[in-house]
Interface confidence: low
């Protein structure tokens, strides 16, 4: 089951995953004028064991004389979802493999890949938010959203972030370095929900292939 919608949209902010939980899928998309090779993989899949995670399959694109007919791949085709894009982002090597077991790094770019990446997130995935050019965060602490399963349904937690134009606010007087622990941050949740620490979120493993689409663009 797909996570409900995409991660929340915050005005004047962009978001990305720093690492991808096992079970995450990445579509093999090619740029215009290219297509996936015949018998080539439709997607890459983050798989692994307790000690090592990596992406299965390789995406390969080949020149195409006809219009690119690569289609969006979803784990469950009957549940198509709207594709959304974030700020242009360059290829990243996000998180130390050892620091987040059960997670894959950002896959390196492949030749002639499309300008946007379409991910299918699994429950437990965390994405981080950051204000874009010309805006500053009123809340100086961590800003993240986690895909959770609650009462049989999936949802993204609401990131605690407001981005305001730099002209609309003065410098932050007496800014203090926030604590590493984001405990106690409020969430707009119903009373039936159980609070979960970041550690629990990062270490819980999704038992099923519950995913959400997330698209990032490349420069």
């Amino acid at each position: 089951e797909l996570c409900d919608d995409d991660p929340p949209e915050i005005p004047h902010a962009t978001f990305k995953a720093m690492a991808y939980k096992e079970g995450t899928m990445l579509n093999c998309e090619c740029k215009r004028g290219f297509r996936r090779i015949k018998s080539g993989s439709l997607y890459m899949l983050c798989t692994g064991n307790s000690s090592h995670s990596s992406w299965d399959n390789q995406c390969q694109c080949t020149s195409s004389a006809t219009r690119n007919t690569t289609k969006q791949v979803t784990p469950q085709p009957e549940e198509q979802k709207e594709r959304k894009t974030t700020e242009m982002q360059s290829p990243m090597q996000p998180v130390d493999q050892a620091s987040l077991p059960g997670h894959c790094r950002e896959p390196p770019p492949w030749e002639n890949e499309a300008t946007e990446r379409i991910y299918h997130f699994v429950v437990g995935q965390m994405v981080y938010y950051q204000c874009v050019q010309g805006y500053r965060a009123l809340h100086r602490g961590p800003a993240e959203s986690v895909c959770k399963m609650t009462h049989g349904k999936t949802r993204w937690t609401q990131p605690q972030l407001i981005c305001t134009g730099e002209m609309e606010t003065s410098q932050f007087p007496g800014e203090e370095k926030p604590q590493a622990s984001p405990e106690g941050r409020p969430e707009s949740e119903t009373s039936c929900l159980v609070t979960t620490t970041d550690f629990q979120i990062q270490t819980e493993m999704a038992a099923t292939m519950e995913t959400s689409i997330f698209t990032t663009e490349y420069q």
């Epitope: 902010a13 962009t14 990305k16 720093m18 974030t86 700020e87 242009m88 982002q89 360059s90 990243m92 090597q93 996000p94 998180v95 130390d96 620091s99 790094r105 950002e106 981080y128 938010y129 950051q130 204000c131 874009v132 050019q133 805006y135 500053r136 965060a137 809340h139 100086r140 602490g141 961590p142 800003a143 972030l161 981005c163 800014e175 370095k177 926030p178 590493a180 420069q219």
Partner: nanobody, 127 residues
């Protein structure tokens, strides 16, 4: 822990250009906002420019706007500072710094909020 090593400094005439590089090793580079600061003899360390992990947020000090450009290459774990139209008052030791985005949701200009620092590279602009 992140280790930062700056390079590219040197002696240049006013109006000239330099490109500083900061190579990062250790923890994942893209998990950090990156900043450039400078310190002239007898003066406090001051903010020059910074970039968020996406490159979408790049504040500059007013004194360098339009002359300096910060960029990052997350595949090479490197952040750059392209400095054009250099002035004698740009003479200083330039430092690269990293700030964990797990702690922050925007790009800060405050030196104390950066977690890791390089040793610096000297830039001298002669008139």
């Amino acid at each position: 822990e992140v280790q930062l090593v700056e390079s590219g400094g040197g002696l240049v005439q006013a109006g000239g250009s330099l490109r500083l590089s900061c190579a990062a090793s250790g923890r994942a580079f893209s998990m950090y906002n990156m900043g450039w600061f400078r310190q002239a003899p007898g003066k406090e360390r001051e903010f020059v420019a910074a970039t968020g992990w996406s490159g979408a947020n790049t504040p500059y000090a007013d004194s360098v706007k339009g002359r300096f450009t910060i960029s990052r290459d997350n595949t090479q774990n490197t952040v750059y500072l392209q400095m054009n139209s250099l002035k004698p008052e740009d003479t200083a030791t330039y430092y690269c710094a990293a700030d964990s985005i797990r702690l922050r949701s925007d790009v800060t200009r405050i030196p104390l909020e950066y977690d890791y620092w390089g040793q610096g590279t000297q830039v001298t602009v002669s008139s």
